[in-house]
Interface confidence: low
């Protein structure tokens, strides 16, 4: 079969599976005169043979792990054994079969993890090797936790990266691990080849012992601090400690107070820096932060609570310079005249603000002293001895001592004796007729004037008139304001009128006095009046159920996903058609009938979140009136942006020749959302060939150092590829290039002869 198994002498490559006994020839080479025989040389390992006539074969099974490629040469010889053709290279590639099991490098691993460590942050790696080809499933390893001991409530506290063998805490582990309850755990880890996907895979196991260490980065107990302290400040009130020495501490005042009376030193001790005043502020909440030497937060901030304890540093204060009460001539003994309510700025419901009231003076003392008494704790004034007579004494002045446990204050009360309230208010009309108004009449409009009169003493509580609507306005759409000089009542609109719910209202007014009527006198029909309010329909725009609708979705939702919905109703009951306005990115569509909102394009948090559009509800038919509301779509981040360099690093150079290895620092970033601790990138060289010349080392989550490994560089530009991984879910990797030039320098700058000015590096290292 010319071509497949036989042919002339030429360079050829053959692939043969390892571990298979020979079953057929590899190739039959044809000799062209004067060649008569063939010869085989190279990595034959006494396995590969060529017969004189050119038949190439192998005599026993191959082993890829011994040699993955056999480089052979075949030459054609003449009758005298002289090479007349060739030698030509013949390559035998040995194809892998799964004939090696994975093996852990250690039968037992030990590690430690701090409680409350960040979930997903590796604290230990297990490592296995497999001699099979890593480019095939035979050598692709898959790590798994077989068992966790102890297992509490069937919850896994640990997880393993199936590909890298990195062990970290789960979210539950981060929250629940506690060395006081359980200081150590054991994991059995398995590794399988075939990517863990085949029943025929080989496996190995190892044991991992994990010690849980205490996390001392904990919020301290709430602190109580007595106000107006006279001790020398600052005073230490509490402390926080990072788990390792060397952290940099700071306090964050989330309330942005005009003065923030706390500080922290580099030991983590927290101080109050000046006396506190409970009456100014009775409690403080602020945060303690620990950062590394580069200013990156080491962990979440701790909440510090300070409660300010009260002392009695405020005297009672009177409600006003003079408090005025009225009492009718005929009022009976024990009747309440009014309550004096003094204030005390000290803490409520404590002895420091608990007040006592005592009458210290009555003027005039006519017809006798002690006409009034005051309830010691309530401050309620009562008539103590007899009814008062206006013609004898129209006014009394009382001096009342109000005291807390340390302070006394004098308050002044004026008691006016007024005529008895024996006349009821009488409406000038019992029926104010009909009034027709459109439902869109402005709030605040006066729609009706009513009038009642009262024959009691003018400008006292006996003759003052208060109007109440007692029927026909359960919604409270109307109110009545009274002119204190004329007792005229002005009926005003307090809330919008509504034809749809109240087209006709039969309103009933009652006119009353603030003072009680004398015994035996009662309000009668003269104190009541009515009127009928007729509301006419105005076509109104639809009304949305909310001013702003908000929804939250992940930025990677599939096109066509429902992301939210809006609702509106038309007061007249017409159907509504919904539409969108301001969808500048073309991301959304709305169902005209239901108000459901769907995505119609890929969403992108990094383009801006929340995404704000307007929704319009329009009447179908009628006047086609419409109203507008807001729809805010909050986009939750997914890890969809690979890391990149934070800025342009063109122009990096070293002066040639290097006198010593040099280094430079670069920064990475990505556009995804990073929580309090910021990104946690890992850095490595982009290809193996760079490792002889360069080294990359991580400084912190965002910065790394690129260093030269030696000084023997040529005078030219090198492009160093760097792999940056964000460790997200899923992890994304970016490969970036740092161009570094080695050049002759003059006074620390790159020197270029005239005519070679393009791309001059500008930053020396």
């Amino acid at each position: 079969q010319e071509g497949k198994f036989s042919g002339p002498l030429k360079p050829m490559t053959f692939s043969i599976y390892e571990g298979q006994e020979p079953s057929q020839i590899i190739f039959q080479f044809k000799a062209n005169p004067p060649a008569v025989t063939f010869e085989l040389t190279g990595e034959t390992d006494n396995i590969f043979v060529i017969e004189r006539e050119g038949l190439l074969y192998y005599n026993r099974a191959l082993d890829r792990e011994t040699r993955s490629t056999h480089n052979l040469q075949v030459a054609a010889l003449d009758a005298n054994g002289i090479i007349v053709e060739g030698p030509v290279p013949i390559t035998i590639k040995v194809k892998d079969i799964n004939d090696n099991r994975p093996t852990f490098l250690q039968s037992k691993y030990e590690g430690s993890v701090r409680q409350n460590s960040r979930p997903g942050k590796p604290f230990l790696y297990v490592n296995a090797t497999d001699l099979d080809d890593p480019a095939t499933p035979n050598g692709q390893l898959y790590y798994q936790i077989v068992i966790q001991l102890p297992m509490i409530n069937n919850v896994m506290y640990f997880q393993i990266n199936n590909k890298t063998g990195a062990i970290s805490l789960t979210r539950e582990g981060s929250q629940e691990l506690n060395p006081a309850k359980n200081p150590s755990y054991n994991l059995v880890i398995s590794v399988k080849d075939m990517g863990g996907q085949s029943e025929n895979s080989f496996s190995d196991t190892t044991s991992v012992d994990i010690i849980v260490t205490e996390n001392i980065w904990k919020a301290p107990k709430p602190v109580e601090m007595v106000e107006n302290s006279t001790d020398p400040h600052p005073i230490k009130i509490t402390q926080v400690r990072w788990n390792d020495p060397g952290a940099q501490y700071s306090l964050v005042d989330k309330e942005k107070l005009p003065r923030f009376p706390f500080s922290i030193d580099q030991e983590g001790d927290i101080y109050v820096t000046q006396p506190l005043d409970r009456e100014e502020k009775d409690a403080y909440v602020f945060y303690a932060v620990a950062k590394d030497e580069y200013g990156k937060p080491l962990s979440y901030p701790l909440e510090i609570h300070v409660k300010v304890k009260d002392i009695n540093d405020n005297p009672p204060t009177c409600p006003s310079p003079v408090t005025v009460f009225e009492v009718q001539e005929n009022e009976r003994l024990g009747n309440s005249i009014g309550t004096l309510t003094a204030h005390d700025r000290d803490e409520e419901n404590t002895a420091n603000s608990f007040l006592n009231y005592r009458i210290v003076e009555q003027t005039p003392k006519l017809p006798m002293d002690g006409l009034f008494l005051i309830q010691t704790y309530a401050g309620m004034l009562q008539l103590a001895k007899q009814s008062l007579k206006k013609q004898d004494t129209p006014q009394y002045n009382l001096t009342i001592e109000v005291s807390d446990k340390d302070f006394k204050t004098l308050c002044f009360v004026q008691i006016n004796v007024i005529d008895i309230n024996d006349q009821i208010p009488i409406f000038e009309k019992s029926d104010y007729g009909n009034l027709t108004l459109a439902e869109d009449t402005n709030i605040g409009s006066t729609i009706l004037t009513i009038q009642a009169t009262d024959a009691d003493e003018p400008f006292t509580g006996s003759s003052k008139i208060l109007y109440h609507i007692i029927k026909g306005d359960s919604e409270g759409r109307l109110g009545v304001d009274t002119d204190p000089h004329t007792n005229t009542g002005y009926v005003i609109i307090k809330k919008p009128l509504d034809f749809e719910t109240a087209a006709v209202s039969n309103i009933v007014f009652k006119a009353e006095n603030p003072e009680p009527l004398v015994f035996g006198v009662k309000y009668n029909a003269s104190s009541f009046a009515k009127f009928t309010l007729i509301v006419t329909d105005v076509n109104e725009a639809p009304q949305f159920s909310q001013h702003v609708f908000q929804a939250k979705v992940s930025e990677d939702v599939a096109i066509g996903t429902k992301v939210g919905n809006v609702t509106a109703k038309d007061p007249e009951g017409l159907d509504i058609s919904y539409s969108l306005r301001g969808d500048t990115r073309g991301w959304l569509k709305i169902d005209h009938v239901t108000g459901e909102i769907f995505s119609v394009a890929p969403l992108d948090r990094e383009a801006g979140s929340p995404y704000r559009v307007q929704v319009v509800a329009t009447e179908v038919g009628g006047s086609s009136l419409s109203s507008v509301s807001e729809f805010h779509l909050i986009l939750m981040d997914v890890n969809d942006n690979p890391p990149r360099l934070a800025k342009d690093y063109t122009g990096l150079f070293f002066c040639h020749p290097l006198s010593a290895p040099g280094s430079l620092i670069f920064e990475a970033t990505d556009d995804d959302q990073h929580l309090f601790r910021g990104p946690h990138f890992t850095f490595s060289l982009g290809s193996g060939s760079l490792q002889n010349d360069w080294e990359v080392s991580k400084i912190n989550g965002t910065h790394a150092r690129l260093s030269t490994r030696h000084t023997e560089f040529e005078e030219r530009e090198y492009v160093v590829l760097i792999r940056i991984n964000d460790g997200g879910r899923p992890p994304l990797e970016g490969i970036v290039s740092l161009p570094v030039t080695f050049c002759s320098c003059v006074e620390g700058s790159c020197f270029r002869p005239a005519g070679h000015q393009t791309g001059i590096p500008t930053v020396g290292m």
Epitope: E280, N314, P315, T317, S320, H343
Partner: nanobody, 118 residues
């Protein structure tokens, strides 16, 4: 009868300064003193407040950084230094005695006119 007496104000150029003073006929311990203003046809609005100890001041957003409220020579007086005045600062400025913040005024002054105009 306790009275509050304001002084100062008048006509001021835009960008200019003026100082208002207020004296109470009685000393109010534990009561705060401050200033409010009223535009024609509008309700009185809060401007600035000084705590009775004189150790804490509060300002409305519209005057923050331009006006400074301070204690006068006595416990029962309060000043308002008004800098970088704008036409919208025109109005009647009232001195007030309050208890427990700007919402509970216990006593009003008669008011003094400030007009900012070129």
């Amino acid at each position: 009868q306790v009275q509050l007496q304001e002084s100062g104000g008048g006509l001021v150029q835009p960008g200019g300064s003026t100082r208002l003073s207020c004296v109470s006929s009685r000393t109010f311990s534990y009561y705060d003193m401050g200033w409010f203003r009223q535009y024609p046809g509008k309700e009185r609005e809060f401007v600035a407040l000084l705590s009775w100890r004189g150790n804490y001041a509060e300002y409305s957003d519209s005057v923050m950084g331009r006006f400074v409220v301070s204690r006068g020579n006595t416990q029962n007086s309060v000043n308002l230094q008004m800098n970088n005045l704008k036409p919208e600062d025109t109005g009647i400025y009232y001195c007030a005695v309050t208890y427990g913040g700007a919402r509970s005024v216990r006593l009003w002054g008669q008011g003094t006119q400030v007009t900012v105009s070129s």
